[in-house]
């Protein structure tokens, strides 16, 4: 019952006389293990006997021993799942069916495997892709339906009988699905391989060729071209005729179209393999090639450079720069189309031949204004001398020359004056179009090259002008020598460096930052009155009366300048103290007596003290001594003392008389 058995093997095994076969085989039986295995050659079923008959190549006996003389056939399987067989060597008469009689505990089965043994080794098969095209890599496959562990073989590739250098990859398969040996070769066919024979040879272990397969390559390729010229010189003279032939050396498939190109541009109505140029002109010089196409694509031949020789044409001069800047380098180039190139040149400047100049180009390293003018040239080659062209103009430009500056006003110039300056030059190319002035200011330019400085500043010391075209040329700066009154006048206290105390020696300095002219006079002023005429004002012993608002003046022939006013403060101890009594110095008892301590001090008195006729300190510290109610016993002399941070001062005595009231007199 086939449903109980599952057996896998290749089906047919191929070999040749003297080789071997290896039959990969696996099985599975429903009830588990195999008990009996018999290998028949061409078995036939005897209906009467209900059993298979035929040559028994192998059977597993109960004791597990092989039948004698059957070492050639080996069962390499087991009783569970493997039924692999080996026959080594194999003979032609082994061809036919191998019958695998398999018996398990409850099931029986006969499996047939075809064995095909040829007399001689059969050839491998070369497999090619459907299309071979030049330079497109393909894989060539050589397949042999044979592989056996006991018999080593090799597959070798040859091209036109020569072993191919490319590395082939050989693989073998000995599986229940297939048995083969395969060689794969990666190959980029070239057009030259078209029609060539590729061979795959089968070699034995000794390298002997056993069999082979051959194929002819059909390599599709673009046309392969060569170009021929008659006459075979590619250098011709104007008016000659030339024929070019495009030879198609190979094309697969056949070519379909032909065209000719000159300098990469197709020539109209030229579609045959032959191109004839009658009476060539210089414009027909160039690189020619033919283009031929087939179904694979177009191909272009090598280029043929056709040179048409002619005498120089009318010349023109190319100047590297015009206008050229004075001092710069200028190159002159004579352009005169000719073939062959001109060998001698003649140069002209303003119609006169330039001596010693016979080259196509020459250089003037430092161009000068006199080099300006028209330059022309003549060129000659073996075919003649060309016409001299109209020439090219050289313009030499340069900055304004000899720039000077003139002060138009009469000198001397005083601060606040209006000054007019003019800027002059001797020559210029191109013409002067503007002027520049230094330093830059909000100044008026009433006309080109004239500058008007209104209300000129004291510090406008030097002015320079430039006349400008494309460049500016500066004149030497002109010193304006502006006269001005002294500037930066300040009072500086030299001594003392700290605050001024009465009796100090005091020195004041009158400083100024600048003056033009330098000769100056000094004046000191206090509260508007003139004090002295030196730069220093000295007080040997300053007194409070010297305090006040001081300023100094510095004058020169142009004018005078005053410093900021400074208040000189003299610090002194309280002085001129006196006691005053608002109600007079006679007071009736019971009334109020008010004594006031008056003083002159800087800084002001911050503390007062009062004393009586016995110099006894009174318990009062204010500026005012108030006795209320006053008594007759208060009669007597009083004085006060004032203190500031400089020192102390005291008043003279003042007498207070307190008289009895009418009531007191009445009681007595």
């Amino acid at each position: 019952d086939s449903s109980k058995w599952n057996i896998e093997h290749p089906g047919t095994i191929y070999a040749w006389e003297g080789a071997c076969v290896w039959v990969p085989c696996t099985y599975r039986v429903l009830d588990g293990a195999l008990e009996t295995f018999i290998l028949f050659h061409n078995p036939e079923y005897n209906q009467n006997m209900s059993k298979f008959e035929g040559t028994r190549l192998y059977e597993n006996t109960k004791d597990g021993k092989l039948p004698s003389g059957q070492k050639r056939v080996q069962f390499l399987g087991n009783k569970i799942n493997n039924c692999t067989l080996s026959i080594h060597p194999v003979h032609v008469n082994d061809s036919g069916q191998l019958g695998l009689r398999m018996v398990s505990k409850t099931e029986k089965w006969m499996e047939r495997i075809h064995l095909n043994v040829s007399e001689r080794p059969f050839p491998p098969r070369i497999q090619l892709p459907p299309k071979l095209q030049e330079s497109q890599e393909v894989t060539l496959t050589c397949l042999l339906n044979f592989s056996c562990y006991g018999y080593q073989i090799q597959l070798q590739w040859l091209l036109e009988g020569v072993p191919m250098r490319q590395a082939a990859v050989t693989s073998t398969s000995l599986s229940t699905k297939s048995v083969f040996t395969r060689s794969e070769l990666k190959f980029s066919p070239q057009w030259s391989h078209h029609g060539k024979i590729v061979t795959c040879e089968l070699h034995d272990v000794d390298g002997k060729v056993l069999s082979e397969d051959m194929v002819q390559l059909n390599v599709k390729h673009t046309p392969k071209l060569t170009i021929e010229v008659t006459p075979n010189e590619t250098t011709v003279r104007k008016g000659d005729s030339v024929t070019m032939t495009c030879k198609v050396n190979s094309s697969n498939p056949e070519y379909t179209t032909v065209s000719w190109l000159k300098d990469g541009i197709p020539l109209k109505e030229q579609n045959t393999l032959m191109l004839t140029l009658h009476k060539v002109t210089k414009s027909q010089s160039g690189r020619y090639c033919c283009r031929v196409s087939n179904d694979v694509g177009p191909a272009t031949s090598e280029k043929v450079f056709l040179q048409v020789q002619y005498a120089p044409e009318s010349s023109r001069v190319q100047i590297s720069q015009s206008p050229a800047v004075e001092g710069s380098e200028v190159n002159f180039l004579c352009i005169s189309p000719a073939n062959p190139l001109p060998t001698n040149y003649t140069w002209y400047h303003n119609g006169k031949e330039v001596q010693g100049r016979t080259e196509k180009q020459f250089q003037i390293q430092k161009i000068l204004p006199w080099h300006a003018g028209t330059y022309s040239c003549e060129a000659g080659n073996i075919l003649g001398i060309g016409e001299r062209g109209p020439g090219t103009e050289l313009d030499v430009q340069y900055p304004p020359k000899k720039v000077t500056m003139v002060i138009e006003n009469p000198t001397p110039i005083r601060e606040g004056d209006t000054v007019t300056l003019s800027c002059n030059y001797s020559s210029s190319n191109p013409i002067v179009n503007h002027y520049e002035w230094r330093p830059r200011g909000a100044w008026e330019e009433p006309s080109l090259g004239v500058l008007k400085i209104q209300n000129i500043g004291w510090n406008n010391t030097a002015v320079a002008c430039a006349a400008c075209n494309n460049w500016c040329s500066w004149a030497s700066p002109v010193t304006l020598n502006v006269l001005y009154a002294p500037r930066g006048v300040r009072v500086r206290k030299i001594k003392p460096l700290s605050e001024i105390h009465s009796g100090n020696s005091v020195s004041l300095q009158c400083d100024f930052s600048s003056s033009h002219p330098k000769e100056v006079q000094f004046f000191w002023e206090k509260n508007g009155s003139l004090l002295g005429k030196e730069s220093q004002l000295n007080f040997d012993s300053i007194s409070p009366e010297d305090a006040g608002s001081y300023s100094c003046w510095v004058n020169n022939s142009i004018g005078q300048t005053a410093s900021k006013a400074w208040t000189l403060e003299v610090l002194y101890a309280p002085r001129r103290l006196r006691v005053s009594m608002s109600q007079g110095n006679q007071v009736m008892e019971g009334k109020t007596a008010t004594l006031i301590c008056e003083s002159d001090a800087n800084p002001p008195v911050y503390s007062y003290a009062w004393f009586d006729w016995n110099n006894q300190s009174l318990p009062y510290s204010g500026r005012m001594l108030r006795l209320e109610p006053v008594k007759v016993q208060h009669s007597g002399a009083y004085w006060c003392q004032g203190t500031n941070r400089v020192g102390k001062g005291h008043s003279p005595l003042i007498t207070l008389t307190v008289y009895y009231s009418p009531q007191t007199i009445g009681r007595r």
């Epitope: 300040r490 009072v491 500086r492 206290k493 030299i494 001594k495 460096l497 700290s498 020195s507 004041l508 300095q509 400083d511 730069s535 220093q536 410093s563 900021k564 006013a565 400074w566 208040t567 403060e569």
Partner: antibody, heavy 125, light 108 residues
């Protein structure tokens, strides 16, 4: 241009004497006070004293009184700072500076400007 | 003598930032008699401000001074690379004239 140019660096031994100078130019040297300022290595500025070249009146900072002598010669626009006996602790940079200033309103301002580039004095045994 | 105390001792800032330096006096400085100086390594000091708030000649307007009595401030509105230095305040209102110990402004 107002400028103060100081004498070059000095290397001395303890106990030796030294006199360094400061020359003024570009202004009336006699009418401006000159100050001497000490700066010990990596430290701040200390006013040592000031001199008025016009009459050589000198005021010392109490910390430096008796340690140094400040003098001036207005005829050659020079101010001087001198030591009679140097100590290692005198190692410092010494600057001279002009005392500028002006008075206006009720104030009189003073400042040090310009300064000399300094004289480095190194005292080491 | 009047003792001037500067703070902070070191100020770490980046270019473009604002710097505020303080100078405090032990007693009132009369008439705002206070100056500020800048000192770069290996150079002499340079006058920046006098009278607490007046800029010296040639000093850029990013430097400004303020204050009176005992508290004074130097402000650099936008630090430039060349402003990294040591800054000293100095009073000239009372003898002896004295300097602060300095504030170092360094690149952060």
């Amino acid at each position: 241009e107002v400028q103060l140019v100081q004498s070059g660096a000095e290397v001395k031994k303890p106990g030796e004497s030294l006199k360094i100078s400061c020359k003024g130019s570009g202004y009336n040297f006699a009418t401006y006070w000159i100050a001497w300022v000490r700066q010990m290595p990596g430290k701040g500025l200390e006013l040592m004293g000031i001199i008025y070249p016009g009459d050589s009146e000198t005021t010392y900072n109490p910390s430096f009184q008796g340690q140094v002598t400040i003098s001036a010669d207005k005829s050659i626009s020079n101010a001087y700072l001198q030591w009679s006996s140097l100590k290692a602790s005198d190692t410092a940079m010494y600057y001279c500076a002009r005392v500028g200033g002006y008075c206006s309103g009720t104030s009189c301002h003073n400042w040090f400007d310009p300064w000399g580039l300094g004289t480095l004095v190194t005292v080491s045994s | 003598e009047i003792v001037l105390t500067q703070s902070p001792g070191t100020l770490s800032l980046s270019p473009g930032e604002r710097a505020t330096l303080s100078c405090r006096a032990s007693q009132s400085v009369s008439s705002s008699y206070l100056a500020w100086y800048q000192q770069k390594p290996g150079q002499a000091p340079r006058l920046l401000i006098y009278g607490a708030s007046s800029r010296a000649t040639g000093i850029p307007d990013r430097f400004s001074g303020s204050g009176s009595g005992t508290d004074f401030t130097l402000t650099i509105s936008r630090l430039e690379p060349e402003d990294f230095a040591v800054y000293y305040c100095q009073q000239y209102g009372s003898s002896p004239w004295t300097f602060g110990q300095g504030t170092k402004v360094e690149i952060k």
